[in-house]
Interface confidence: low
């Protein structure tokens, strides 16, 4: 810290502000009767250079003039841009132990003269806004630089406003605080910016504009829409605008869309009819304004109006599927399933479904409404049945969709051939097949149906299905497909009055199972051992199990175990083996195999076959 220069003064020539590349002379003078006591000749004045409070140089060798013990002049060169602090200190050379005493200091600013301001741009936001201009100041001057914005217009009127740039703030914009009104629409204005600092001054080229060039209308406000006769596709958009607006741009889109519908409207006077809206769809509407057909600038977009168009009656066709199950010799249970309409087909909130089951000869008709996407009824096994379902919203119902109830897997000749299921990636499976070889009626369509092979899945979960045209022999199934889960996949071929199906298991990704089957019992019958097991818990299967392996070896033997491989069947939980020696103790265990590999072994069981009873 420098104590208000009690001991002396420091001066700079030619000035404390110099252009980049210039030299300066700094003189340090002691006040009378100040200095080292007793020995004025021992007074040594030193000059220290600080940059950002850090001592960077002792200018002892730069002394150009010296009045011993009274004053010294130092020349400084190669000063960098910005502020540099010089501190003069008094060093009493006869007292080595005392540090130099500060005398006084000075800051020298190095900078450049301002460049002419460029790219002046002026804007007035709205008819009642004020004129604000911005410009490019050019290179940083590293000095406090004053800017004057001057606006000249009709009636010999000029207004000006000032601001400054320094190392803390940048001045490249000024709001003049004056408003240009529409009655000056034909007038021309000239604006210029002048920059001045301690090293020089410069002026921009004059910039000329008219009212229309610079006034940007305020965005429209109070946007609303009226739907004609509660139509879901036609509406009148209304809004408020500034009085001088002659051109509007409208943009609107469904909320989940990525592209806008754009409309230009001339002399709309705050109203425009839209005729191509989608019913029961959340829309976003925005409007922009312009004061002149050819010149001027568009306003910012208005705030969004978000609203939903009204409902209209559904137009889609429901995708129906069903399951048949015989209950006893004269009754069957029919479970109908259907997929929800997509929003563009539903055109509103579906309130319920109308379901009809009808015997073709019209002897019996069952009707019901449900809010669910499935319906189950018990009907006689006799007769030919047809089902229909339609969807209803607040405006009406869709056309009913019909399906004939046939025995889905009843006709072997209609069974598709060479059905295969290949995992494509983590969440889908490619199913391919060949058409039935000797179908006595034409295939009208294929249905690919799938469900997870987990306990209770038939009763708990509805099936998933895809309708495939008769000339296609493949389907990529992805709905509700998860990795490491085995699915039963059926391909149905349907004709007008018959059905045939083939079944296969498939998974989208597989790993070796977590564990092997658990052997629950080993029993001996007629020289054969029956191994019984419980299946691997569903979450531990990790894909479709292809087969089980039963291993056995003599207890304490180091030989490789023997094994028997069984094709996996869900219904099977025991298997005979017959090649074991009587009265030898064996160790048995099981593993499971998926396409990814073999599980670790399950539990071990020991057994000693008794052989023939004497």
């Amino acid at each position: 810290n420098i104590d208000v220069c009690k001991l002396g003064t420091v001066t700079v020539q030619p000035a404390p502000v110099i252009p980049l590349g210039s030299a300066a002379n700094i003189s340090c003078s002691l006040n009378p009767k100040q200095g080292c006591s007793h020995y004025p000749s021992s007074n040594e004045l030193i000059l220290l250079k600080f940059v950002n409070d850090v001592l960077v140089e002792n200018l002892h060798g730069k002394k150009v003039h010296d009045h011993t013990g009274h004053s010294s002049t130092f020349q400084v060169t190669n000063l960098s841009l910005g502020m540099t602090l010089f501190v003069c200190k008094l060093n009493c050379s006869n007292s080595q132990k005392k540090p130099p005493v500060p005398v006084c200091g000075v800051e020298i600013s190095v900078g450049v003269a301002p460049e002419p301001p460029q790219n002046i741009s002026c804007v007035q936001e709205g008819e009642n806004g004020t004129v604000a201009c911005s410009w490019n100041s050019g290179k940083v001057t590293y000095l406090k630089t004053n800017y004057t914005l001057q606006l000249s217009g009709p009636n010999n009127l000029t207004c000006q406003k000032q601001c400054f740039s320094d190392n803390r703030q940048n001045c490249n914009r000024l709001d003049l605080g004056i408003n240009l009104s529409p009655d000056l629409a034909e007038s021309r204005f000239i604006v210029r910016v002048t920059a001045i600092n301690d090293l020089g001054n410069s002026s921009s080229l004059p910039h000329t504009f008219t009212f229309l060039d610079i006034v940007i209308p305020l965005p429209p406000w109070d946007i609303r829409i009226n739907f004609l006769n509660a139509s879901g596709s036609r509406g009148t958009l209304q809004w408020e605008d500034e009085g001088q607006v002659v051109l509007n741009q409208l943009r609107y889109q469904p909320l989940n869309s990525t592209s806008w519908n754009m409309v230009n409207a001339t002399n709309a006077k705050g109203k425009y009819d839209l005729r191509d809206l989608r019913p029961f769809t959340e829309y976003e509407f925005q409007i922009s304004s312009k004061l002149h057909l050819s010149g001027g600038s568009w306003s910012n977009w208005s705030e969004s109006l978000r609203t939903r168009t009204p409902e209209e009656e559904p137009v889609g066709i429901l995708d129906i599927w069903y399951m048949k199950q015989d209950i006893d010799y004269d009754r069957q249970q029919i479970s109908l399933f259907w997929k929800s309409l997509n929003p563009s087909e539903a055109r509103g909130k579906i309130l319920h479904y109308q379901v009809t089951l009808q015997e073709v000869t019209k002897k019996t008709t069952l009707q019901n409404t449900t809010r669910h996407t499935s319906w189950t009824r018990v009907i006689p096994r006799t007769g030919a049945w047809t089902a229909s379902v339609s969807a209803a919203n607040s405006k009406g119902a869709s056309a009913p969709t019909h399906i004939n109830i046939v025995d889905l897997c009843g006709t072997g000749l209609l069974a598709p051939h060479q059905v295969s299921a290949k995992s494509e990636n983590m969440d889908n499976i490619l199913v391919t097949w060949q058409p039935p070889k000797k179908a006595d009626s034409a295939v009208r369509e294929y249905i690919v149906e799938w469900r997870a092979l987990q306990p209770g899945s038939i009763t708990k979960f509805p099936p998933h299905w895809l309708r495939i045209p008769p000339d296609n022999m493949s389907a990529l199934i992805s709905e509700n497909i998860k990795p490491y889960i085995c699915y039963e996949i059926r391909v149905h071929a349907l004709s007008e009055s018959q059905g045939g199906c083939s079944s296969i298991r498939g998974d989208s990704k597989h790993k070796a199972p977590v564990s092997g089957p658990h052997i629950t019992a080993i029993t001996e019958k007629k020289e054969r051992l029956f191994i019984s097991w419980t299946h691997i818990p569903f979450p531990e299967q990790r894909g479709c199990i292809l087969h089980y392996r039963i291993y056995w070896k003599e207890r304490d033997s180091t030989a490789q175990p023997e094994l028997c491989e069984i094709q996996y069947r869900r219904s099977q939980n025991s298997h005979p083996i017959s090649s074991l020696q009587p009265r030898v103790t064996y160790v048995l265990w099981m593993t499971a195999v998926t396409a990814a590999g073999e599980s670790p072994q399950g539990n071990e069981r020991e057994f000693c076959p008794q052989g023939k009873a004497n």
Partner: nanobody, 129 residues
């Protein structure tokens, strides 16, 4: 992911003191420039104090706070502090911690917002009786 988290702000009477902290995570800033900026309502964010990050870790202060504010840091804890004494009503602002990924030695650069690559969310300091 680099994060700067300020804390220590609050309501204090004129003449009082506060100690603001800035904890850096996701990167070590011990050798790089760090700074405190503040932004009062309706004004631009302004430089308050900074550390150059060069060998001696030079401290920078805006003249308006010189002598009242002290900036420091603990490199091991990756933390920077701003001790504020003799608070005035005009010190009321949101105080932001900023960090660069380079050393800053130019007086002209240390106080520019564009110098800094990472910013905290800010802590409110209100000076009122």
């Amino acid at each position: 992911q680099v994060q700067l988290q300020e804390s220590g702000g609050g309501l204090v009477q004129p003449g009082g003191s506060l100690r603001l902290s800035c904890a850096a995570s996701g990167r070590t800033f011990s050798n790089y420039a760090m700074a405190w900026f503040r932004q009062a309502p309706g004004t631009e964010r302004e430089f308050v104090a900074g550390l150059s990050g060069s060998g001696g870790d030079t401290a920078f202060y805006d003249n308006s706070v010189m002598g009242r504010f002290t900036i420091s840091r603990d490199s091991a804890k990756n933390t920077m502090w701003l001790q504020i004494n003799n608070l005035k009503p005009e010190d009321t602002a949101v105080y932001y911690c900023a960090a660069a990924t380079h050393v800053v030695v130019s007086y002209g650069l240390v106080r520019r917002r564009g110098t800094y690559d990472y910013w905290g969310q800010g802590t409110q300091v209100t000076v009122s009786s």
